[in-house]
Amino acid sequence: ECVTQLLKDTCFEGGDITTVFTPSAKYCQVVCTYHPRCLLFTFTAESPSEDPTRWFTCVLKDSVTETLPRVNRTAAISGYSFKQCSHQISACNKDIYVDLDMKGINYNSSVAKSAQECQERCTDDVHCHFFTYATRQFPSLEHRNICLLKHTQTGTPTRITKLDKVVSGFSLKSCALSNLACIRDIFPNTVFADSNIDSVMAPDAFVCGRICTHHPGCLFFTFFSQEWPKESQRNLCLLKTSESGLPSTRIKKSKALSGFSLQSCRHSIPVFCHSSFYHDTDFLGEELDIVAAKSHEACQKLCTNAVRCQFFTYTPAQASCNEGKGKCYLKLSSNGSPTKILHGRGGISGYTLRLCKMDNECTTKIKPRIVGGTASVRGEWPWQVTLHTTSPTQRHLCGGSIIGNQWILTAAHCFYGVESPKILRVYSGILNQSEIKEDTSFFGVQEIIIHDQYKMAESGYDIALLKLETTVNYTDSQRPICLPSKGDRNVIYTDCWVTGWGYRKLRDKIQNTLQKAKIPLVTNEECQKRYRGHKITHKMICAGYREGGKDACKGDSGGPLSCKHNEVWHLVGITSWGEGCAQRERPGVYTNVVEYVDWILEKTQAV
């Protein structure tokens, strides 16, 4: 059962796992949610009736029954983790805490103009978990405007105390706001020889990398595969750090793989969701339950639905035994990973999918692409929407992309002459324009947010957000596309598609069926040569064939340039301007979305 509200002046008795310090009960709930075992918590707020050493304590708790006895206690705030909930969860915390000093290891001290600058510095520093900033009014002259970057083993403060004229806050890495590089490569036959901060068991290097990503201190990792010569180290995932933030030594070793934390890419690739099955593999751990199940998929479902289950092993039924049902072992451990991994015993193992909701919805795999042809099929581009105007008569106006459950990203130039959002309708999950009838459901538009530097498409800033009146329920035919990570600026995308109903201003003919065209990206330098009278800025991206043979008219203004990278689709561009439709075959010019990620997040996350 999902319980989101906090219980004031209430304490849960017993079930303690560990105690951490958090600046608020709300953040305590987030910490509990991300902890592998925590189901309930009790937070102590500052209060004259409480011992100051207990202020800001966040006690993480577990219970076999998923609940604990409640006791009345002033200043105590209790609640449940969001593990039991189905809604999207985020660790992003933009709050600034006034007059609080969050203690940790102060490893960097520098002058900053503001708390915001200090927070940005923390976000762009690989080691930083949180910061404390002494304001202009701080009594000690030599400490004024000092920005202290801090880290701890747990990622949360070791203590929190009251201190006048300082402010504290957390790194915004988990808000996708870091400019740190996103290095997705996994290096085969490589060992990073740096200090280990932790070790866990993992079935493969990808899971090891994801564990490293959500471990607060892990910057890179080394994984020993099941073929590793030393038996006791097989399937061992070593979580590592270094002072520089990079591996100091790389050793060539067969059957080992190494890689980096994906903390700067976490909004555009799954880091919590381990969805694969591992055949002929047994995961050992504390047994929670043994249930009969028809298949390993059914076993995974049972694990996902059992809130305390972290991983499972399924042993298929022996012929004609137990109505063809196998045994599903639901398991858990102190850190969410198996205590040992065994091979060759015939089991099929995997992880709960409950953690998938901690990843961005946009990372969910969509159904395979239909190769060839120019007409799309249903569900092929589930983020594509058709934006209609109802004035003077209803017609398709522009394309757009779902980027959140209340947000559509499109082009600013679509709204020339649009006086009010009331005349706009957003249709999602549409393949053919002819499907749209009087009674077809649509999303009304609450607000049009146009970039304030926009003047005309050709000058850039051709980007706009539509805030919908109601939220989109994600399904196979309507779901979001990931924004590119800022750490991905140097990625070379090779699998890019432009989609739309083929409508361009001045060309009234629209296609009934959603069209698609695979087009290569063109360097800005090459593109600039093709558009000598227009400045191709770094905030634009160009795509299209050097020479004829591909109809670049498939995209609508405002629609997506979608690129697949590491099995995840990213919204790399927004169809903006260009001469792709005419005989000229110049590349199309698109708004370069990665350059607007901060703007998008600022607008969509505004309270």
């Epitope: 005309m456 050709e458 000058s459 000598r532 075959e585």
Partner: antibody
């Protein structure tokens, strides 16, 4: 009808500058690019640069980059080309031209040309 | 920069002749090729754009063809007013460049 009318002939000393004007009429001035092309006596055509009157964006041929400045005044629908540090090799007929397409392309309308003579 | 090499530089022909002028680009220029006619003391006039499209008011005896790097301007039956200098131009990549010209004279 579309017309581009250029300023009259100029005689200039080496080292000085010349500014040639090109007044457009008969179309929406800010919607098309204005190019400048020159032709030395008995020679071919050489592109000097372009201006987008709508945005003010200019792009110059590397050969002239440090010496040429192209501007446009939307209020009078007039484009200007200024060439500095003149030398005798700059003696030529200077043409302004409009591009056929919004984004560049062939040059469909040309001014009558302005003869610039550089001589000491 | 893309070089446009025009040939021949000079061409003598008679009224009624069929004439062909060629232009070779130093690299592929897609379909971004135009042809101009220029008479002494006058500005160039656009004849053909996008390789083969005749500009408004240009007689049908003028035609363009080619692809990639090799392009041709053909005048099917020379008229007295066609004696002039002809230039090809690529518009594929900045800076736009012109051929050196073909002077068509009366034989």
């Amino acid at each position: 009808q579309v017309q581009l009318v250029q300023s009259g002939a100029e005689v200039k000393k080496p080292g000085s500058s010349v500014k040639v004007s090109c007044k457009a009429s008969g179309y929406a001035f800010s919607n098309y690019l204005i190019e400048w092309v020159r032709q030395a006596p008995g020679q071919g055509l050489e592109w000097m640069g372009v201006i987008n009157p709508g945005s003010g964006y200019t792009n110059y041929n590397e050969n002239f980059k440090d010496r040429v400045t192209i501007t446009a005044d939307e209020s009078t629908s007039t484009a200007y080309m200024e060439l500095s540090s003149l030398r005798s090799e700059d003696t030529a007929v200077y043409f302004c031209a409009r591009t056929y397409g919004k984004y560049g392309g062939a040059m469909d309308f040309w001014g009558q040309g302005t003869t610039v003579t550089v001589s000491s | 920069d893309i070089q446009m090499t025009q040939s021949p530089s000079f061409l003598s022909a008679s009224v009624g002749d069929r004439v062909t002028i060629t232009c070779k680009a130093s690299q592929s220029v897609s379909n971004d090729v135009a042809w101009y006619q220029q008479k002494p003391g006058k500005a160039p006039k656009l004849l053909i754009y996008y390789i083969s499209n005749r500009y408004t008011g240009v007689p049908s005896r003028f035609s363009g063809s080619g692809s990639g790097t090799d392009f041709t301007l053909t005048i099917s039956s020379l008229q007295p007013e066609d004696f002039a200098t002809y230039f090809c131009q690529q518009d594929y990549s900045s800076p736009p460049t012109f051929g050196q010209g073909t002077k068509l004279e009366i034989k």
